[in-house]
């Protein structure tokens, strides 16, 4: 039968962060072409990326609808090309992918301090309210928008002039900590679902210290 | 039985407003894509779009983008393509066919569309 | 887009006789369907995937190709397969036919 040289795809893989969602997938086709279909448990198989030479499959658009759904994904392989013989195929192979419920378990990407803003002994802390892909009345929603009280944020920060870190956390994206008075502080913020079980926490974000550009500083 | 039965021949003046239906039967209609092709007197085939029913996700040939307009009615399982003002150029047989892969090949049996003054 | 050439654009040739039908792409292409109409007919699946046999063609039809260049062959003309021939590539958006190729009795 013409399917007598596809095979079907393995090790199905979803790739999500601040749900961009991409389903990966082996083997680099020869001979043949993928056509990718996704579902909720309840609803109908639909097909994306058509007969495609990739082995990736970005289905953002079709996550996004409902975050908190669970899908199944399953990737066709269909001959294209030299197999060995010509005819009737029968149905075509396809995997299975793992079901995945985007948010439970995207990635949550790094995240950036936008500003820190010194008066005195206090420093307040801003982290930037990354934008995702999730859509509500034709607007973008922030990763705060969508995860509302789940998602907290821990600071760390440390005088520059030593290592002993210390830590703050709070369930908006801003952070109001005391600081001695002439010192320099270098701050990291990670981004963390505590009611999670996987991917819980993002990687830090990237140091930023008093005395740069991104702080203003007003001495009182 | 997969069947595609389409709307009867349409003879329009330029101008005027026209939509043609496809109804599917025999198979779950929102599961699969629907797609629309032209063809021009005495012309080869041309892709023009298609639709997914479920949830009107469309994917269209730019070429076609501000000429027509492709929409669904899942409650009575018919996909449509329609015109708000049409030109003589418009003139052909439009079918449509559910996306299939491989040997599964369902088409509509046409809908013949003359515009002329 | 991916722009589909035919040739020839009409073959003319007698029953028992090999035809062989081109079609070209302007870029490349991994996946090819081939068509057959007739007048006042739908058109119909004939070759899809390349080479792949649609249900009921019989073994006398042939496809091949990579890359840019494809061909349906029928290896002995028979009388019911007198008619318009149409390649299609589902390899990137938007999907393009080539302008047919019309085989006719000599």
């Known amino acids: 039968s013409g399917t007598t040289n596809t095979v079907a795809a393995y090790n199905l893989t979803w790739k999500s962060t601040n749900f961009k969602t991409i389903l990966e997938w082996e083997p680099k086709p020869v001979n043949q072409v993928y056509t990718v279909q996704i579902s909720t448990k309840s609803g109908d198989w639909k097909s994306k990326c058509f007969y495609t030479t990739d082995t990736e499959c970005d289905l953002t658009d079709e996550i996004v609808k409902d975050v908190k759904q669970t899908y199944l994904a399953r990737v066709f392989s269909y001959p294209a090309g030299n197999v060995e013989s010509t005819g009737s195929a029968g149905e075509p192979l396809y995997e299975n992918s793992p079901e995945f419920t985007p948010y439970l378990e995207t990635n949550l990407g790094q995240p950036t301090i936008q500003s820190f803003e010194q008066v005195g002994t206090k420093v307040n802390v801003t982290v930037e309210d990354e934008r995702t892909l999730v859509r509500r009345n034709n607007t973008f929603l922030s990763l705060r928008d969508v995860f509302g009280k789940d998602l907290i944020y821990t600071l760390y920060y440390w005088k520059s002039s030593s290592s002993g870190k210390k830590t703050a956390k709070t369930n908006t994206n801003e952070f109001l900590i005391d600081v001695d008075k002439g010192e320099n502080y270098c701050f990291s913020v990670q981004a963390v679902i505590p009611s999670r079980t996987v991917n819980r926490k993002s990687t830090d974000s990237p140091v930023e210290c008093m005395g740069q550009e991104k702080g203003e500083f007003r001495e009182i | 039985e997969v069947q595609l039965v389409q709307s009867g021949a349409e003879v329009k003046k330029p101008g005027e407003s026209l939509k043609i239906s496809c109804k599917g039967s025999?198979?779950?209609?929102?599961?699969?894509?629907m797609n629309w092709v032209r063809q021009m007197p005495g012309k080869g085939l041309e892709w023009m779009g298609m639709?997914?029913?479920?949830?009107?996700?469309?994917r269209l040939n730019q070429k076609f983008k501000d000429q027509a307009t492709l929409s669904v009615d899942k409650s009575i399982s018919t996909a449509y393509l329609q015109w708000s003002s049409l030109k003589a150029s418009d003139t052909a047989m439009y079918y449509c066919?559910?996306?299939?892969?491989?040997?599964?090949?369902?088409w509509g049996q046409g809908t013949t569309v003359t515009v002329s003054s | 887009e991916i722009v589909l050439t035919q040739s020839p654009a009409t073959l003319s040739l007698s029953p028992g006789e090999r035809a062989t039908l081109s079609c070209s792409a302007s870029?490349?292409?991994?996946?090819m369907n081939w068509y057959q109409q007739k007048p006042g007919q739908a058109p119909r699946i004939w070759i899809y995937?390349?080479?792949n046999l649609a249900s009921g063609i019989p073994a006398r039809f042939s496809g091949s190709g990579s890359g840019t260049d494809f061909t349906l062959t029928i290896s002995s003309l028979e009388p019911e397969d007198f008619a318009v021939y149409y390649c299609?590539?589902?390899?990137?958006?938007?999907?393009?036919f080539g302008g047919g190729t019309k085989v006719e009795i000599k």
């Open positions: 995937g390349i080479s």
């Open positions: 299609q590539q589902k390899s990137s958006f938007p999907w393009t």
């Open positions: 870029s490349s292409v991994s996946y």
């Open positions: 066919a559910r996306e299939d892969y491989g040997s599964s090949d369902y």
């Open positions: 639709i997914y029913p479920a949830d009107s996700e469309t």
């Open positions: 025999g198979y779950s209609f929102t599961s699969y894509w």
